[in-house]
């Protein structure tokens, strides 16, 4: 906002390679747009459609990828009478190299090959224990032998010193198809490694982004307090302690003799005090006697500890 009245914008010689469909959002009042001096390769569908007042568009590029995604541009420019200052020549595919986009027949704008990499194996959401090594794998295919670069992002930030393993397997079909694989190695993971990871594979024709895979780092529960065997008399209060740490925080659950349906629970004489890590049974009865199990569970796993409650008649 604040630029909706801008009428003239010059972006000459700014190393612009592609024009995204939202590149000029908020500039609906533009009348003159100069993108000259940029080796533009692609213009996304309807990139200029919101600029209803556009009278002059300058483009001078001999780098256009004349595939199916560019098919819309020549008729749109002609329909809006904006072709006068547009010098746009195909660089790819080879069969259209050197031709003006205005002289290429519409049926020749095809996507037979896939010059821009296409993701074929997505990184997968995973859970890891603290201290373990994990890896994310991402593969892409391309029919271009143009050099490929690999990057990984964590929570939308590029990992600058990522431990990556990159390799290429070449298929020899009618033309060569390159199968690129990038592996992100995360060694001895900590909670700081938690986040959403995404691979970015880029060549001369553009970048492809994988899905985001979440890494959750867990710690198995471990007891900080365990229940002890106790002997008490009927009508008194039984007190059993149990607490555990872990990541995520473990949930504590109690069972008696392997089941959750026991007298103290049914009769609402069972009370759990989360802040005190204490399990109470009030007004103890003879049939409350048995083995009580405290189970601490989180997504990493579970642990149990037992205590025997012996009840004596008063």
């Amino acid at each position: 906002s604040g630029l909706d009245s801008l009428s003239k914008l010059t972006l000459f010689g700014n190393k612009i390679k592609s024009v995204a469909k939202r590149a000029f959002s908020g500039l609906e009042g533009l009348e003159h747009l100069n993108l000259g001096g940029n080796a533009i390769r692609s213009v996304q569908f309807d990139a200029f459609v919101k600029m209803k007042n556009l009278k002059e568009l300058h483009i001078s590029s001999d780098s256009f990828l004349c595939d199916c995604q560019l098919k819309w541009l020549p008729p749109w420019l002609i329909g809006r009478m904006l072709q006068a200052f547009v010098t746009a020549t195909c660089a790819h595919p080879e069969s259209l190299k050197g031709q003006s986009i205005f002289s290429v027949p519409p049926e020749s704008f095809v996507c037979d090959d896939f010059l821009k990499p296409q993701i074929i194996t997505q990184p997968e959401t995973t859970m890891a224990m603290v201290g373990k090594d994990i890896r994310f794998t991402c593969s892409a295919a391309s029919s271009s032998s143009s050099p490929m670069t690999f990057a990984w992002k964590k929570d939308n930030e590029v990992l600058t010193n990522a431990d990556m393993e990159n390799f290429v397997h070449v298929h020899a079909q009618d033309g060569e198809v390159m199968e690129y694989t990038t592996i992100l190695h995360l060694r001895q993971v900590t909670f700081g490694h938690e986040g959403r990871y995404q691979c970015v594979i880029t060549n001369h024709f553009g970048s492809t982004y994988s899905h985001k895979a979440r890494l959750t780092v867990n710690v198995l529960p471990s007891f900080t307090k365990t229940p002890h065997d106790i002997t008490i008399r009927t009508t008194t209060v039984a007190r059993l302690e149990c607490a555990a740490t872990g990541h995520p925080n473990p949930q504590i659950a109690w069972q008696k003799d392997g089941g959750t349906d026991f007298p103290a629970a049914r009769e609402r004489r069972m009370h759990v005090m989360p802040d005190d890590d204490v399990f109470f049974i009030t007004d103890v009865k003879i049939d409350d006697a048995g083995v009580y199990s405290c189970t601490a569970q989180n997504s990493a796993g579970s642990i149990s500890a037992n205590a025997t409650l012996t009840v004596l008649e008063t």
Partner: antibody, heavy 127, light 112 residues
């Protein structure tokens, strides 16, 4: 001299385990994908497994999937094959082989060929 | 059963030319490069050809190979007695993750 030397073969009972090693020398081990290939007595070559140059990717023949594990220690220039739940049909000479790889600017290009082979180690699975 | 089909045996006299075929499908040979190996009895295999038609250093140009569609062919000219061996073709089956496959092997006999 570029060399691969396998070890760890021997006689093992069905259901048993064995770990093969392949010591590499004379080349930058961490720049090459590596493979295991076996040959049963009097039979042809059978591909077993391959591992990428950094160890991040591993692939297996269906006949050994879930039973065999390929790994590598680039600091020791050594390739391994852990073989569990061995069967009589796993009896073979096991070769380790180097996949032609061309590494440039952090990317390794894997060719189809395996250009360096070890002398093989015999694994016999029998009761 | 074997994915790549080779003739079990071929034979020719010294000095002659011999061809060994390797037949597959669109998912293996049709989609990937082919390599060829020579194995003398009692020895480890040796790479002769990789990436359809490339020779490693040290392999004489008497050995050549070609690929057309779903078939590949190894050619040996000026046959020598030392060429008597088993020959195997190999390729990837589908993508990298599907793994590598070998042909059943062809025994080359050099007639004396």
């Amino acid at each position: 001299e570029v060399q691969l030397l396998e070890s760890g073969g021997g006689l093992v009972q069905p259901g048993g385990s064995l770990r093969l090693s392949c010591a590499a020398s004379g080349f930058t081990f961490s720049n090459y994908a590596m493979s295991w290939v076996r040959q049963a007595p009097g039979k042809g070559l059978e591909w077993v497994s391959v591992i990428s140059h950094g160890g991040g990717s591993t692939y297996y023949a269906d006949s050994v999937k879930g039973r065999f594990t390929i790994s590598r220690d680039n600091s020791k220039n050594t390739l391994y094959l852990q073989m569990n739940s061995l069967r009589a049909e796993d009896t073979a000479v096991y070769y380790c082989a180097r996949v032609i790889s061309n590494c440039h600017l952090g990317v390794c290009y894997y060719s189809n060929g395996m250009d360096v082979w070890g002398q093989g180690t015999l694994v016999t699975v029998s009761s | 059963q074997l994915v790549l089909t080779q003739p079990p045996s071929v034979s020719a006299a010294p000095g002659q030319r011999v061809s060994i075929s390797c037949s597959g499908s669109s998912s293996n040979i049709g989609d990937n490069y082919v390599s060829w190996y020579q194995q003398v009895p009692g020895s480890a295999p040796k790479l002769l050809i990789y990436d359809n038609n490339k020779r490693p250093s040290g392999i004489p140009d008497r050995f050549s190979a070609s690929k057309s569609g779903t078939s590949a062919t190894l050619g040996i000219t000026g046959l020598q007695t030392g060429d008597e061996a088993d020959y195997y073709c190999a390729t990837w089956d589908g993508s990298l993750s599907a793994g590598r496959v070998f042909g059943g092997g062809t025994k080359l006999t050099v007639l004396r």
